[in-house]
């Protein structure tokens, strides 16, 4: 949908001066040739003919894969996660050797409360999504457990998560601390030690748009680039129009080369256009200069 | 599934003692924990005893030295002996159990439940 079709015109002529015939083709970009049975096809930059028309790589569009989109997709995903990895002394439960059996109703009792106990815990954290239990160990229960964190994909997803494992921090040291055995006896839902609560590592989803636009622009990384709009990446090149980066060809065509983004300059009836963008106009009868 | 069934519940005057007791079936009675809990009109369920499978027992301050809670775990059956009762022991007393070798008195702890039996101290 964010890519030009090409708009074909008398003739086309480069920023340079010199006059090329459309569709144009890089010279500097580099030509293979795919021969599949009788049927000889021009498909370059790596593209395939199927018996009917070239299947071109991105970036790579046109009859014959020889022009170069102007965006990319780039699919973020919709959500991302962190996981944290935590471990918590419960005091208020002995251990018994059925608790590391998880399928032992001791296990699945004990999964219940500490599930309660934890959504309890961190029901103010929008992100929080469960936990998970890892592994119960003695002591009296060691529990090594997963909590899990999911907030949507936005530019600005990673100090959402980080916000949010802080919080997760915060929230469990609390309640370690304040829920405690008094007398041998708990009057909470689970009683923890103090200090049994440990961080040990956090996951959190790594996603780059900047990265998956470079790799999937090949040769042309270094033109291609990231914008936002509605808070999604999109993977353009300057030739995309309507974005800060968009180069403006004014009487012209924008086409990507290995060099970059240039300006194929118009030559209609009555005028030729030049420059960079190709923003100057001659009349022909005149030889008269328009800015 | 677990089933609880407490009785020995009734009428006794200030000063007097009762014993209830709770059959237990469903479960392997001697591992985890049992416990006592009572609720009096208007006012939230309160953890009384508890008694776990390693013989550790644990009282709520307002009955320490009154009551003493036991189990037979031949017959299934965990019992409670309530002396010295006093008006503010009136309450429907549950029995409740836990697979769990538990050191808690918060309702929320336990999840299964009897259905209770009437306890009023009197004159």
């Known amino acids: 949908p964010l890519a030009t079709i090409p708009v074909s015109t008398t003739s086309l002529t480069s920023s340079e001066g010199s006059t090329i015939s459309t569709p144009s083709v890089d010279i500097s970009t580099p030509v293979t040739t795919s021969i599949v049975g009788d049927q000889c096809s021009r498909c370059k930059n790596g593209g395939f003919w199927d018996g009917l028309k070239c299947q071109c790589l991105t970036p790579y569009y046109g009859e014959s894969c020889e022009e170069v989109v102007n965006s990319i997709d780039i699919a973020p995903p919709e959500t991302v996660s962190a996981q944290m990895e935590l471990t918590v002394t419960v005091t208020s439960v002995k251990f018994t050797d059925e608790l590391k059996n998880h399928s032992s109703q001791e296990f699945r009792e004990f999964n219940k409360t500490f599930t309660e106990q934890m959504n309890i815990v961190y029901s103010g954290i929008p992100e929080y999504v469960g936990v998970n239990i890892t592994n119960l160990r003695l002591g009296s229960v060691v529990v090594e457990h997963d909590v899990l964190l999911r907030t949507k994909y936005t530019p600005e997803y990673k100090t959402a998560l980080d916000n949010a494992t802080e919080v997760v921090k915060q929230k469990i040291t609390k309640v370690t601390t304040e829920q405690i055995m008094t007398n041998d006896n708990c009057s909470a839902l689970m009683c923890f030690n103090t200090t049994g609560t440990q961080v040990q590592n956090i996951t959190v989803t790594q996603y780059d748009p900047v990265e998956e636009c470079r790799q999937k622009a090949e040769e042309y990384e270094d033109y291609f680039l990231v914008e936002y709009r509605d808070q999604k990446p999109y993977c353009i090149s300057p030739c995309e129009s309507g974005f800060n980066a968009s180069k403006n060809c004014n009487h012209g065509k924008c086409q990507m080369s290995q060099n970059g983004a240039r300006c194929l300059c118009v030559t209609t009836e009555t005028h030729w256009y030049s420059g960079e963008d190709c923003n100057q106009g001659t009349q022909k009868s005149h030889h008269h200069h328009h800015h | 599934e677990v089933q609880l069934v407490e009785s020995g519940g009734g009428l006794v005057q200030p000063g007097g003692s009762l014993r209830l007791s709770c059959a237990a079936s469903?479960?392997?009675?001697?591992?985890?924990?049992m416990s006592w809990f009572r609720q009096a009109p208007g006012k939230e369920r309160e953890g009384v005893a508890i008694?776990?499978?390693?013989?550790?027992?644990g009282y709520a301050d307002s009955v320490k030295g009154r009551f003493t809670i036991s189990r037979d775990n031949a017959k299934n059956s965990l019992y409670l002996q309530m002396n010295s009762l006093r008006a503010e022991d009136t309450a429907v007393y549950y029995c409740?159990?836990?697979?769990?070798?538990?050191?808690?008195?918060?309702?929320?702890?336990?999840?299964?439940w009897g259905q209770g039996t009437m306890v009023t101290v009197s004159s």
């Open positions: 469903g479960f392997t009675f001697s591992r985890g924990s």
């Open positions: 008694i776990s499978s390693d013989g550790w027992t």
């Open positions: 409740a159990a836990s697979f769990l070798v538990l050191r808690a008195l918060n309702p929320k702890a336990w999840h299964y």
